[in-house]
C-alpha cells in the first residue's frame, strides 16, 4: 500500500535549488531502485516533479497560496523491470502553506567552491543562497541579507545577492591553499531580531602556472653499454614545478650537444621525468663520450605570468659508452648456395666470411652446427669458411638442405654467432623412368588388327629443366614377330595395339609384353617393363566374359612368345 | 544514440560453452535491465533470461536455468550471456535487449552460434 | 508459462489495406489498469524493432499508422494503412510473469 500524510509546502520560494514536497512510498520497495514513480495531475512535469527512483517530489517554481492552495495529483509505482504496477494509481494532495515564522535556509549546508590562485579583487567565486519561506508581503520577514562572519580579510560577500568574491590581491596557492568562510544570512533585511542562518563555504585555490620547472642539478652522468639497442632507457632526470596538475607537466626535449641525433628524450606522463633513450646504435669504437643539453619547459603557459621570466629550464647529460665484447659479424644475412647432386666428396660449395666488429679483431673459426646437419652431409673449413661435401648427394632425397653455420672468437669462445645457408641440389638424370602402374590387360579373341587395348604412363624421379620425354618401344627380344605393336604418342604416353585378327585363348592364353621406357637426358636411362595381356572370350560388344584363370594362378610356362 | 554492439559469430561443438558479449553505450549501463533473447532458424523468439547491472540480480527462463549464466562488467558496460552444454538445437541467433518497463526497447544486432560436430 | 497464441500465422494484403494481428494469452496480463502487452516488427535477417508498448502507446518514432488495443487476455495490433516497407513477422510479447514469453508471429505479406 501506498505510505504518505497529506503534503504541505511553503510558498514563495526563492532557492536556486528545487524545493522539496515530500516523498512518495510504496511499502512494496526494497530501496533497490526496482521501482519506477510517475507522477500525473495537476502541474504534473511542470511545477511538479517527481525522482523515479525515490519518489521524492520537488516543486520547481515558486507557488502562490493565492493564487491555488490545492493541488490535486496522482501517483504510480511501477516495477521497472516488468512494467507492472506495484499498487493501484493513486490520487493525493499537496496543501501551499502560509507561515512566517521561519529562519531563511542555505540551499546548502556547505559549499565548495574554487576560484585560481593570484586571481584580481573582486573576482567571482560562488553564490550562496539561504531561502526564507514567509510571506514576502508581510514585512520584512522574508528579507535575507547576507555577511562574512569568517574569512576575511582574503574574502567578501555581497550583502543582498550572496556572491562572494576574493578581496586580497596576489593570493597564492603554493603558500596557502584552503580557505573556510562562514556566511551568515538574516532575514528582516539585516536588522535586529531578524533571524538568521548561517553556512559554510569551503574555498580552494585552484592551480594557475606561476612557476617554471627546475633542475635539481645541472649536470646528470650516465652510462650504457654499447651494445643498447635503440629504444633503450639510460637514465632519468626529474625537473620540479611547484604548480600542480596540467600547470606542472614537463615536456623534456634534447636541444644541443655532439648527442642530438644519437640519443631520445621521453617524458613519462605518470613521474613527469625525462627518460634518456637510445636511438641510434652506439659503437663504443667510434665514439666513446656524448654531451646532450636537456631542457624541460611547461607545454600550457600562462602569457600574463611570463614577465616571471622563462617557464623552461635546462641541464647538461653527459653519456659515457661502454666497451662490450660484440660477437663476430657474418657478411650477409643469409646464404644460398647450390651444388650437382653428383659431385663427389670434398667438393666445394663456397665460403662465409665473419669479423670480429670490436677494435681487438679477434681471430674466427667457423663451425657447423651439426643439430642442423645430423647425417654429416657438409663440412667447413675452420680457417677460412670454405663448405664442402662429405658425403654424397641425391636431389631425389632431398632437395634443400639448411644448415647453420657458426663463426666463433677464438679467443673467446662464448662470442659466437650464427648464420643460415640454404644449400639447394641439382639435378643430374641418374634415374630411369618407369611404368606409371601395374599393367595386366586383356584381348577379345575375335579382336581386329591395329586395335588399342591399353595405354601406358611413365614416371621419373628426375626434373630435367626442360621437362620428361619419354620414348616407349617393344624390347629387341621381343620386337621380331610379336603379336602387339608399341605406338609411341610422343606426349609421354604409349599404345598397346593388336597386330593381326583374331587370337585363340586355347592355344595362347596370356602374353608377356616387355617395353622399354627411356627418357631424353643425358646420360640417357631407361627400363624394362613387362605388361601381361590375357586372352578373353567377349561379347558382339567386346565386354569380358571369360578368361583362363590359370593365368594368374600358375604363369609358370607361359610363352613369352609376345 | 544508444546502442547494443554483439560480439562476432561463433561455431561450437555439442557438449562445450559459448559465452556472447553486448557491449552498452549511448545511456547509464545500471540503469536498465539487459536481457537476452534467441531465434532458431525460421523459428520465433525466445526470452532466455536477463539481468539488473545495478546489483546482478538474474532471471532466468526454467528452460536454460541449469545452462545459462548472464553476467556484467560495470566497468565496460558490457553483459555477457554463456551457455553451456551445446546441443545443435542451441544453432540459434541471440539477442541482447535493453530492459523498459517490460518491452524490449533496443537490441543488439545478434550474434549467430552454430552447434556442429 | 503464460502461453501467447497469435493469428493468423501468415496474411496477405494489399497496399493500403488494413491489417489486424490478435493476440491471446492463456492468463490475463493486465494489472491495476495497465495491460503489459508488446509488440514488435521483425524483418528479416535483422533484430526486432519495439512498435507497441503496454498494449496501446506507440513507442517513440513510429510511423501512426501502427496502433495496438485490448485487455486482459484479448490484444489487437492493427496497420490502418499497409506500406511496402511493413513486410516482416509482427510478434506481441507479455511481461506480466516470468518467464516472459512472445507469440508465434505473423509473417505479412504484400498481395
Known amino acids: 500500500s501506498w505510505m504518505w500524510n497529506q503534503f504541505f509546502l511553503l510558498e514563495e520560494y526563492t532557492g536556486s535549488d528545487y524545493q522539496y514536497v515530500g516523498k512518495l512510498h510504496s511499502d512494496q520497495d526494497r530501496g533497490d531502485g526496482s521501482l519506477k514513480y510517475i507522477l500525473s495531475g495537476d502541474g504534473a512535469g511542470d511545477l511538479f516533479i517527481i525522482n523515479e527512483n525515490t519518489g521524492d517530489i520537488q516543486a520547481t517554481k515558486r507557488l502562490d497560496r493565492e493564487e491555488k492552495p490545492v493541488y490535486i495529483l496522482r501517483a504510480q509505482a511501477i516495477n521497472r523491470r516488468t512494467g507492472r504496477p506495484v499498487e493501484p494509481e493513486s490520487e493525493f494532495i499537496i496543501k501551499i502553506h502560509d507561515i512566517n515564522d521561519n529562519e531563511p535556509i542555505f540551499t546548502k549546508e556547505v559549499y565548495t567552491a574554487t576560484v585560481p590562485e593570484m586571481s584580481d579583487v573582486g573576482t567571482f567565486v560562488v553564490q550562496v543562497t539561504a531561502t526564507d519561506a514567509d510571506d514576502p508581503t508581510y514585512g520584512n520577514s522574508a528579507k535575507v541579507v547576507y555577511s562574512i562572519l569568517q574569512g576575511q580579510p582574503y574574502f567578501s560577500v555581497e550583502s543582498e545577492t550572496g556572491i562572494i568574491k576574493t578581496a586580497l590581491l596576489n593570493m597564492d596557492r603554493e603558500n596557502r591553499e584552503q580557505y573556510q568562510v562562514v556566511i551568515q544570512a538574516k532575514d528582516m533585511g539585516g536588522q535586529m531580531g531578524g533571524l538568521s542562518g548561517t553556512t559554510t563555504v569551503n574555498i580552494t585555490l585552484t592551480d594557475v602556472n606561476d612557476n617554471p620547472p627546475r633542475f635539481p642539478q645541472s649536470t646528470y652522468q650516465f652510462k650504457t653499454p654499447e651494445s643498447s639497442p635503440p629504444g633503450t632507457p639510460i637514465g632519468r632526470i626529474k625537473a620540479s614545478d611547484a604548480d600542480v596538475g596540467e600547470n606542472a607537466e614537463i615536456e623534456y626535449s634534447i636541444t644541443d650537444g655532439e648527442g642530438l641525433d644519437m640519443f631520445d628524450v621521453i617524458t613519462d606522463q605518470e613521474t613527469q621525468e625525462g627518460i634518456i633513450t637510445v636511438k641510434k646504435l652506439l659503437d663504443f669504437e667510434k665514439k666513446k663520450v656524448y654531451t646532450l643539453k636537456v631542457e624541460a619547459s611547461n607545454p600550457y603557459v600562462e602569457p600574463r605570468f611570463l614577465y616571471l621570466g622563462p617557464f623552461k629550464d635546462s641541464a647538461t647529460v653527459r653519456i659515457v659508452v661502454e666497451d662490450v665484447d660484440e660477437p663476430p659479424v657474418f657478411s650477409k644475412l643469409a646464404y644460398i648456395l647450390q651444388i650437382r647432386e653428383d659431385a663427389q666428396i670434398n667438393t666445394t660449395i663456397g665460403s662465409v666470411t665473419a669479423q670480429d666488429p670490436d677494435a681487438a679483431r679477434n681471430p674466427v673459426k667457423y663451425s657447423v652446427d651439426r643439430h642442423t646437419d645430423m647425417d654429416r652431409i657438409f663440412n667447413i673449413d675452420s680457417g677460412n669458411g670454405s663448405i664442402f661435401t662429405s658425403k654424397l648427394l641425391d636431389r631425389e632425397t632431398l632437395l634443400w638442405h639448411n644448415i647453420t653455420v657458426i663463426a666463433t672468437e677464438i679467443n673467446n669462445p662464448k662470442q659466437s654467432s650464427r648464420v643460415p645457408l640454404y644449400i639447394k641440389v641439382l639435378d643430374v638424370n641418374d634415374n630411369a623412368p618407369e611404368f606409371a602402374e601395374f599393367y595386366e590387360t586383356f584381348v577379345c579373341e575375335k579382336a581386329k588388327a591395329d586395335q588399342l587395348i591399353q595405354t601406358l604412363h611413365a614416371v621419373d624421379k628426375d626434373d630435367p629443366y626442360s621437362g620428361h620425354q619419354f620414348s616407349f618401344s617393344l624390347a629387341p627380344e621381343a620386337a621380331s614377330g610379336s603379336n602387339f605393336t608399341i605406338q609411341d604418342n610422343k606426349d609421354n604416353t604409349a599404345g598397346i595395339l593388336t597386330r593381326k585378327n583374331g587370337y585363340n585363348r586355347h592355344e595362347m592364353s596370356t602374353y608377356l609384353l616387355p617395353v622399354v621406357i627411356s627418357d631424353n637426358d643425358y646420360p640417357v636411362q631407361s627400363s624394362t617393363g613387362t605388361v601381361t595381356v590375357r586372352v578373353c572370350a567377349c561379347d558382339h560388344h567386346g565386354n569380358m566374359q571369360s578368361c583362363h584363370a590359370e593365368a594368374l594362378i600358375h604363369p609358370t610356362g607361359l610363352s613369352t612368345g609376345a | 544514440e544508444v546502442q547494443l554492439v554483439q560480439s562476432g559469430a561463433e561455431v561450437k561443438k555439442p557438449g562445450s560453452s559459448v559465452k556472447v558479449s553486448c557491449k552498452a553505450s549511448?545511456?547509464?549501463?545500471?540503469?536498465?535491465?539487459m536481457h537476452w533473447v534467441r531465434q532458431a532458424p525460421g523459428q520465433g523468439l525466445e526470452w532466455m533470461g536477463d539481468?539488473?547491472?545495478?546489483?546482478?540480480?538474474?532471471h532466468y527462463t526454467q528452460k536454460f536455468k541449469d545452462r545459462v549464466t548472464i553476467t556484467v562488467d560495470k566497468s565496460t558496460s558490457t553483459a555477457y550471456m554463456e551457455l553451456s552444454s551445446l546441443r545443435s538445437e542451441d544453432t540459434a541467433v541471440y539477442y541482447c535487449?535493453?530492459?523498459?518497463?517490460?518491452?524490449?526497447?533496443?537490441w543488439g544486432q545478434g550474434t549467430t552460434v552454430t552447434v556442429s560436430s | 508459462d503464460i502461453q501467447m497464441t497469435q493469428s493468423p500465422s501468415s496474411l496477405s494484403a494489399s497496399v493500403g489495406d488494413r491489417v489486424t494481428i490478435t493476440c491471446r494469452a492463456s492468463e490475463s496480463v493486465s494489472i491495476h489498469g495497465t495491460h503489459l502487452m508488446h509488440w514488435y516488427q521483425q524483418k528479416p535477417g535483422k533484430p526486432p524493432k519495439l512498435l507497441i508498448y503496454?498494449?496501446?502507446n506507440l513507442e517513440s518514432g513510429v510511423p501512426s499508422r501502427f496502433s495496438g488495443s485490448g485487455s486482459e487476455t484479448d490484444f489487437t495490433f492493427t496497420i490502418s494503412s499497409l506500406q511496402p516497407e511493413d513486410i516482416a513477422t509482427y510478434y506481441c510479447?507479455?511481461?506480466?510473469?516470468?518467464?516472459?514469453?512472445f507469440g508465434g508471429g505473423t509473417k505479412v505479406e504484400i498481395k
Open positions: 510479447q507479455q511481461s506480466f510473469e516470468d518467464p516472459w514469453t
Open positions: 535487449a535493453r530492459g523498459d518497463l517490460g518491452r524490449f526497447d533496443y
Open positions: 549511448g545511456y547509464t549501463f545500471t540503469n536498465y535491465w
Open positions: 503496454a498494449a496501446s
Open positions: 539481468i539488473d547491472p545495478s546489483h546482478s540480480e538474474t
